[in-house]
C-alpha cells in the first residue's frame, strides 16, 4: 500500500521501562525515517508508550502479542497489530503525549493508520494555545509513582504518547474488545460516532467469558509509594490543572488530508488536598502525568498540555 510521504511523524526521545504484556493489546513500529527505531505499545487503557526494540522484554512482548493476534485470528477475533509506518489516523490526539515526543502527521490524502481520539464521556481538561513543540521539550505523563524501595528500573517515565480511541471506525489500532469509556480527565471532543448513553453510576456492568485473552481497557489508576498500597477514595497529591473547556467541535470535519501539529506546554497549578490520609511513608511524584489536548479547527492543530490525572492519583486506604 502506498503511504505517500514517509516523513517521521512520531519521535521517541525516551523509552518506557517494562510494562507487563498482559496489559498490552497492540504494538507497532515507527518509521525507518525516524532514525531511532522504536516500538509503539498500546496498553489496555489505550495509551501509547515508546519502547526500545532492542530490549528483551519488548521482544518478548511483541512475540507474545503476535501469538495472541494469531490465536484471535484463528478464533475470529479482531485483535490487530501493525508493522511499519506509524501514521496518524484522520482524527488527531486528545490524550497524553510526552517527553520530547513529536507527532507530525503528514497530509497524504490517504486514510491514516493512527487515530487518537478521546472518548465522548471523558471530562474536558484542556488548555488554550501554546507555542509549537520543539524536539527536546520535556513533558511528563503517565501516572506511575513507583514503590520504594525499587530497583534501578523505575516505571515507564515520560514516555506516554497519547491515548488512542477506544472505539474507532478505522481498524488498525482496534483491539479484540469494545471499550466502555469510564470517567477520566482527558479532553473531550465530538467524534462522528455516537457516544454511549449508559449511565455509569446506575447501570450494572455485565460480562461473561466467550473467548480467552479479551482485553480489558480500564480507567482509574492507583499510585504507589514507599512500598505501600493505601487507596484513599479521592486523594490527589500532585498538581492539578483547573478545568478548561475543550473545543468540542474540532474533530467533526477532519478528513484524511488533514494536518495536525503537536505542541507541549508546561502547566503549573495548585494541588488538591487529599480527602483521606495516605498511609505512612511519603510518596514522591515521578515525571509521568497524562497530557491533555484540545483541538483548534482554525489552526487544525493539537495542543498538548501536561496535567496530572486526578484519577491516577486516586489511592485507597
Amino acid at each position: 500500500q502506498h503511504h505517500g510521504v514517509t516523513k517521521c511523524n512520531i519521535t521517541c526521545s525516551k523509552m518506557t521501562s517494562k510494562i507487563p504484556v498482559a496489559l498490552l493489546i497492540h504494538y507497532q513500529q515507527n518509521q525507518a525515517s525516524c532514525g531511532k527505531r522504536a516500538i509503539i505499545l498500546e496498553t489496555r487503557q489505550h495509551r501509547l508508550f515508546c519502547a526500545d526494540p532492542k530490549e528483551q522484554w519488548v521482544k518478548d512482548a511483541m512475540q507474545h502479542l503476535d501469538r495472541q493476534a494469531a490465536a484471535l485470528t484463528r478464533n475470529g477475533g479482531t485483535f490487530e497489530k501493525q508493522i511499519g509506518e506509524v501514521k496518524p489516523r484522520t482524527t488527531p490526539a486528545a490524550g497524553g503525549m510526552d517527553e520530547s515526543v513529536v507527532l507530525e502527521p503528514e497530509a497524504t490524502g490517504e486514510s491514516s493508520s493512527l487515530e487518537p481520539t478521546p472518548s465522548s464521556q471523558e471530562a474536558q481538561r484542556a488548555l488554550g494555545t501554546s507555542p509549537e513543540l520543539p524536539t527536546g521539550v520535556t513533558g511528563s505523563s503517565g501516572t506511575r509513582l513507583p514503590p520504594t524501595p525499587k530497583a534501578q528500573d523505575g516505571g515507564p517515565v515520560g514516555t506516554e504518547l497519547f491515548r488512542v480511541p477506544p472505539v474507532s471506525t478505522a481498524a488498525t489500532w482496534q483491539s479484540s474488545a469494545p471499550h466502555q469509556p469510564g470517567p477520566s480527565l482527558w479532553a473531550e471532543a465530538k467524534t462522528s460516532e455516537a457516544p454511549s448513553t449508559q449511565d455509569p453510576s446506575t447501570q450494572a456492568s455485565t460480562a461473561s467469558s466467550p473467548a480467552p485473552e479479551e482485553n480489558a481497557p480500564s480507567e482509574g489508576q492507583r499510585v504507589w509509594g514507599q512500598g505501600q498500597s493505601p487507596r484513599p477514595e479521592n486523594s490527589l497529591e500532585r498538581e492539578e490543572m483547573g478545568p478548561v473547556p475543550a473545543h468540542t467541535d474540532a474533530f467533526q470535519d477532519w478528513g484524511p488530508g488533514s494536518m495536525a501539529h503537536v505542541s507541549v506546554v508546561p502547566v503549573s497549578s495548585e494541588g488538591t488536598p487529599s480527602r483521606e490520609p495516605v498511609a505512612s511513608g511519603s510518596w514522591t511524584p515521578k515525571a509521568e502525568e497524562p497530557i491533555h489536548a484540545t483541538m483548534d479547527p482554525q489552526r487544525l492543530g493539537v495542543l498538548i498540555t501536561p496535567v496530572p490525572d486526578a484519577q491516577a492519583a486516586t489511592r485507597r486506604q
Epitope: 517494562k18 498482559a22 496489559l23 522484554w57 471499550h179 455509569p200 456492568s205 460480562a207 467469558s209 492507583r222
Partner: antibody, heavy 122, light 107 residues
Framework: EVQLVQSGAEMKKPGATVKISCKAS????????IHWVQQAPGKGLEWMGW????????RFNERFKGRVTITADKSTNTAYMELSSLRSEDTAVYYC???????????????WGQGTTLTVSS | DIQMTQSPSSLSASVGDRVTITCRAS??????LAWYQQKPGKAPKLLLF???TLAEGVPSRFSGSGSGTDYTLTISSLQPEDFATYYC?????????FGGGTKLEIK
C-alpha cells in the same frame, strides 16, 4: 480501610450454577480491577479472570472459558462471579482480590476477600 | 501459558533460621513476580511484588531476588508467625499463574 467481603458458603449439585458476591468498601469501586481466584482443597491458587467494574471487557483464564460470568453492581459496590455447569472438581474456595489498574504496574493482588467455600456434590 | 514451579514443596525450619524458597518460570517474566503468604483458613497476603518491592506492613526480614526465570524469596530470620504456605505468582502474561506453594513448617 479497604475491605472485600464475600458471600457465604454454598452447596450445589453438579450441573447447577453458583453466584458468589464480593462487596468492596474503602476505595473507589469502579477504579480498580477485581480478580477471581480459585483454590481447590489442598491445592494451589488458580487465577480465573479479571474485571474492572464499569467496563464490559473482562479477561478470563482459558480453563474457565464459557462457564464464568462476572458482573458488577456499582450502586452497591459489589462484584459477582457466576460459575455454571458445576462439576465436583469445582469444589473449592473462591477469592475475589483487587489489583492496581495503573497499566504499567501489572496485576499483583494487594487486597483479598475472605473466600467463599463452594461444595459441589450430588 | 507460563508455568511456575516452586521448590521445595515443603520445608521444616526453626525460629531464627534463614529460609530460601525458589520459584522458576517456564518463560521469562521480566521481574513481574509477586510473593504471597497464606495461613490455614485465611486468604493469601501480598508480601512482595515487582522488582522485589516489599508490600505495605511486611517486615523487612522478607526479601526477594532473581531475574529472568529464576526467583527467590528469603526470610532472613524466621519468626513464629512466619510458618505458613508461600506462593509465587507471575503477572507478566495472562493467564496469571501461581507456583504450587511451599509449606513452611516448624522443625
Amino acid at each position: 480501610e479497604v475491605q472485600l467481603v464475600q458471600s457465604g458458603a454454598e452447596m450445589k449439585k453438579p450441573g447447577a450454577t453458583v453466584k458468589i458476591s464480593c462487596k468492596a468498601s474503602g476505595y473507589t469501586f469502579t477504579n480498580y480491577n477485581i480478580h477471581w481466584v480459585q483454590q481447590a482443597p489442598g491445592k494451589g491458587l488458580e487465577w480465573m479472570g479479571w474485571y474492572l467494574p464499569g467496563d464490559d471487557s473482562p479477561r478470563f483464564n482459558e480453563r474457565f472459558k464459557g462457564r464464568v460470568t462476572i458482573t458488577a453492581d456499582k450502586s452497591t459496590n459489589t462484584a459477582y462471579m457466576e460459575l455454571s455447569s458445576l462439576r465436583s472438581e469445582d469444589t473449592a474456595v473462591y477469592y475475589c482480590a483487587t489489583s492496581p489498574t495503573d497499566e504499567t504496574q501489572g496485576d499483583y493482588f494487594d487486597y483479598w476477600g475472605q473466600g467463599t467455600t463452594l461444595t459441589v456434590s450430588s | 501459558d507460563i508455568q511456575m514451579t516452586q521448590s521445595p514443596s515443603s520445608l521444616s525450619a526453626s525460629v531464627g533460621d534463614r529460609v530460601t524458597i525458589t520459584c522458576r518460570a517456564s518463560g521469562r517474566i521480566h521481574d513481574f513476580l509477586a510473593w504471597y503468604q497464606q495461613k490455614p483458613g485465611k486468604a493469601p497476603k501480598l508480601l512482595l511484588f515487582t522488582d522485589n518491592t516489599l508490600a505495605e506492613g511486611v517486615p523487612s526480614r522478607f526479601s526477594g531476588s532473581g531475574s529472568g526465570t529464576d526467583y527467590t524469596l528469603t526470610i532472613s530470620s524466621l519468626q513464629p508467625e512466619d510458618f505458613a504456605t508461600y506462593y509465587c505468582q507471575q503477572f507478566w502474561s495472562t493467564p496469571y499463574t501461581f507456583g504450587g506453594g511451599t509449606k513452611l513448617e516448624i522443625k
